[in-house]
């Protein structure tokens, strides 16, 4: 995840200019003590990505994202791999050598998108791994 | 990944006391401009984890770990999911709302471990997801 910044007052509206219509997305790094790895709300507007000229439908989708700390001890909710558990222990002993595991999607879902291809044909395609179903420490 | 720290002189030997015998592991965050997401060397000694009393063999194993930036544009080497590509674009536009994707294992291998169980029986067990085979942006 990105570096931590100082807390700022970011009371977002759902207007297009403001925040990609990312309803109920707070600042992902508002305090020095980050919360544990979990799934967060994120609505992605294809217009805001500049894809509105080729994507017909949907207008956007609930993508979600993963963020948070993967700190010792990793509990069951964190869907940690064996490697992540080992890496957490190594980080605990040698914090300057190895980072903590990172909070990443463990399960992703597909969405269907209707779009114009390069030849202006309308294509209905299923795009894999577009929506976060669950997050874990990896 | 963890926060960046100031560069320190850490010329590690492979001795056990010093660095968990993490041969050729440099500081994972030595400069403000992190390198791109990739696989790094990491040897894990079960002794250093305090597991020497119940693990008979091996003494340790090459676990590797993933670290580095997942910045725009994500190239083919970064094994990025569709969601990671979308998240990178959203982060580019709204850096305070959503973190960059994180560098995490995309493929993991198992190792076999010989150990004593609670009844002092010797067990040979295959532990899944112990060794990083490849890293990617998630």
């Amino acid at each position: 995840a990105a570096n931590k910044r100082k807390n700022q007052n970011r009371n977002k509206s759902s207007s297009h200019q403001d925040s990609s219509r990312m309803s109920s997305v707070g600042d992902y790094n508002t305090s020095e003590q980050k919360q544990a790895c979990k799934k967060h709300e994120l609505y992605v507007s294809f217009r805001d990505l500049g894809w509105q000229d080729w994507i017909i439908a949907p207008e956007g989708y609930a993508a979600f994202y993963c963020d948070g700390e993967c700190s010792f001890p990793l509990n069951a909710h964190m869907n940690a791999t064996n490697h992540a558990i080992v890496q957490t222990l190594v980080h605990l002993m040698f914090p300057d050598h190895v980072p903590k595991p990172c909070c990443a999607p463990t399960k992703l879902n597909a969405i269907s998108v209707l779009y114009f291809d390069d030849s202006s044909n309308v294509i209905l395609k299923k795009y894999r791994n577009m929506v976060v179903r669950s997050c874990g420490c990896h | 990944a963890a926060n960046k720290r100031k560069n320190q002189n850490r010329n590690k030997s492979s001795s056990h006391q010093d660095s968990s015998r993490m041969s050729s592991v440099g500081d994972y965050n030595t400069s403000e401009q992190k390198q791109a997401c990739k696989k790094h060397e990491l040897y894990v000694s079960f002794r250093d984890l305090g597991w020497q009393d119940w693990i008979i063999a091996p003494e340790g194993y090459a676990a590797f770990y993933c670290d580095g930036e997942c910045s725009f544009p994500l190239n083919a080497h970064m094994n990025a999911t569709n969601h990671a590509i979308v998240q990178t674009l959203v982060h580019l536009m709204f850096p305070d709302h959503v973190p960059k994707p994180c560098c995490a294992p995309t493929k993991l291998n198992a190792i076999s471990v010989l150990y004593f169980d609670d009844s002092s029986n010797v067990i040979l067990k295959k532990y899944r997801n112990m060794v990083v085979r490849s890293c990617g942006c998630h």
Epitope: A57, S112, L114, N121, V122 | -
Partner: antibody, heavy 121, light 108 residues
Framework: QVQLQESGPGLVKPSETLSLTCTVS????????WSWIRQPPGKGLEWIGY???????HYNPSLKSRVTISVDTSKNQFSLKMSSVTAADTAVYYC???????????????WGQGTLVTVSS | EIVLTQSPGTLSLSPGERATLSCRAS???????LAWYQQKPGQAPRLLIY???SRATGIPDRFSGSGSGTDFTLTISRLEPEDFAVYYC?????????FGGGTKVEIK
Amino acid sequence: QVQLQESGPGLVKPSETLSLTCTVSGDSIRSYYWSWIRQPPGKGLEWIGYIYYRGSTHYNPSLKSRVTISVDTSKNQFSLKMSSVTAADTAVYYCARICSSISCWGWFDPWGQGTLVTVSS
Amino acid sequence: EIVLTQSPGTLSLSPGERATLSCRASQSVSSSYLAWYQQKPGQAPRLLIYGASSRATGIPDRFSGSGSGTDFTLTISRLEPEDFAVYYCQQYGSSPLTFGGGTKVEIK
């Protein structure tokens, strides 16, 4: 139920700009694609272009250089402007709705009743 | 662009007869993205069929659509007096969206 009503001048001089407005009632314009189609007297139908309520547009390449479609969500209206008109642009101009979901994109339903625009000096 | 050719140009039939209208595309219409409309004099077109074969809401079951690829058909199983009109096909599988030239179904 949703109804569409075209309005604008019935007579436009050659080389001037044709301006029409479609008012949508019975439904919010804040979904769907909104389209313009024309039909010269005694001839077939020609799609002009469409707009999404958030402003993205798609035009028929044959008319693209002369056409602008815009939307006013506060008035539940969308508009057509066609510049440099000639007698060949004389037609009945229809506005129509296109569904904007994956399962129902691309056909026109419903239509406005149409308005005849004559280009003549 | 995809050119749609409708045939025949005019179909002269009596009430109660079966009408078969053809729409041929210059290239394949993806996913059967084809619609049919009915237009009566002085009125706007009305959607009959979408997706090549799905009837629009309120359309009688004597109207049916079929076909895929480049060849599509609209069938009216038994012509009623109110069915005499001009029929247009429209493809939305490629941009620009295009219409056929129309088939006029007239009373014999």
